[in-house]
Amino acid sequence: LQDPCSNCPAGTFCDNNRNQICSPCPPNSFSSAGGQRTCDICRQCKGVFRTRKECSSTSNAECDCTPGFHCLGAGCSMCEQDCKQGQELTKKGCKDCCFGTFNDQKRGICRPWTNCSLDGKSVLVNGTKERDVVCGPSPADLSPGASSVTPPAPAREPGHSPQ
């Protein structure tokens, strides 16, 4: 014998109190699959959350975060405070990056400046709280006597087009 509830489509539930007929989901609830014996309560987007997609009889509401905060977790399960560039979020709130670190985003942690010397390069542009250092040529390339002029391209025979 086929279960009579299997005929109930999404947006309805199989109502045991009414001889298992298919009843529409009550307001503020939904069923996203057929054959459900109950409807699920819609997610409420309030406070730090705001509604991105309204709940319908067949799908749950979707939330994002009120401006000033950003989503974390699957399906925006949490909202986390934004900070300014040059800051990171701590339990004491947004705090400036320590000297030698930077953050170029509104979220995440302050990261150490690149150590140019590890790659045998020199610092071309100093780092700030908001920006990483820019590494330049190696110090050897900048030593006196080292030519910084680009060598001329090898001569081509007349009549030959570049490859």
Epitope: L72, G73, S77, M78, K91
Partner: nanobody, 123 residues
Framework: QVQLVESGGGLVQPGGSLRLSCAAS?????NYWMNWVRQAPGKGLEW???????????YYVDSVKGRFTISRDNAKNSLYLQMSSLRAEDTAVYFC????????????????SGQGTTVTVSS
């Protein structure tokens, strides 16, 4: 069902005081960091203060330090914000919000908040 309900807002004159309350239900308050955040008219959401599970750690945004005090009564499943020396710029909707699982370790995300209570500071 997990729920937070704020109360205690109202109209107050500059320099005045108010005490906001937040009643928690559907979960054990003592297991979570709790926060107050606010949204001034036409502005984004701003974090105000937080308090750890047993009330031994409390932190505030610079603009309210020395004027606001966050506290909690875990036995009553309640969170409070005592606001004094109120200024026009404190006018906002105030929300209490729960720190999500792992708050202060992996993240500072808030996973539940209430509908808010409105504080208006005006003469």
């Amino acid at each position: 069902q997990v729920q937070l309900v704020e109360s205690g807002g109202g109209l107050v004159q500059p320099g005045g005081s108010l005490r906001l309350s937040c009643a928690a239900s559907g979960f054990t308050l003592s297991n979570y960091w709790m926060n107050w955040v606010r949204q001034a008219p036409g502005k984004g959401l701003e974090w105000v203060a937080n308090i750890n599970q047993d009330g031994s750690e409390r932190y505030y945004v610079d603009s309210v330090k020395g004027r606001f005090t966050i506290s909690r009564d875990n036995a009553k499943n309640s969170l409070y914000l005592q606001m004094s020396s109120l200024r026009a710029e404190d006018t906002a909707v105030y929300f209490c919000a729960r720190g999500g699982e792992g708050y202060g370790v992996d993240h500072y995300g808030l996973d539940v908040s209430g509908q808010g209570t409105t504080v208006t500071v005006s003469s």
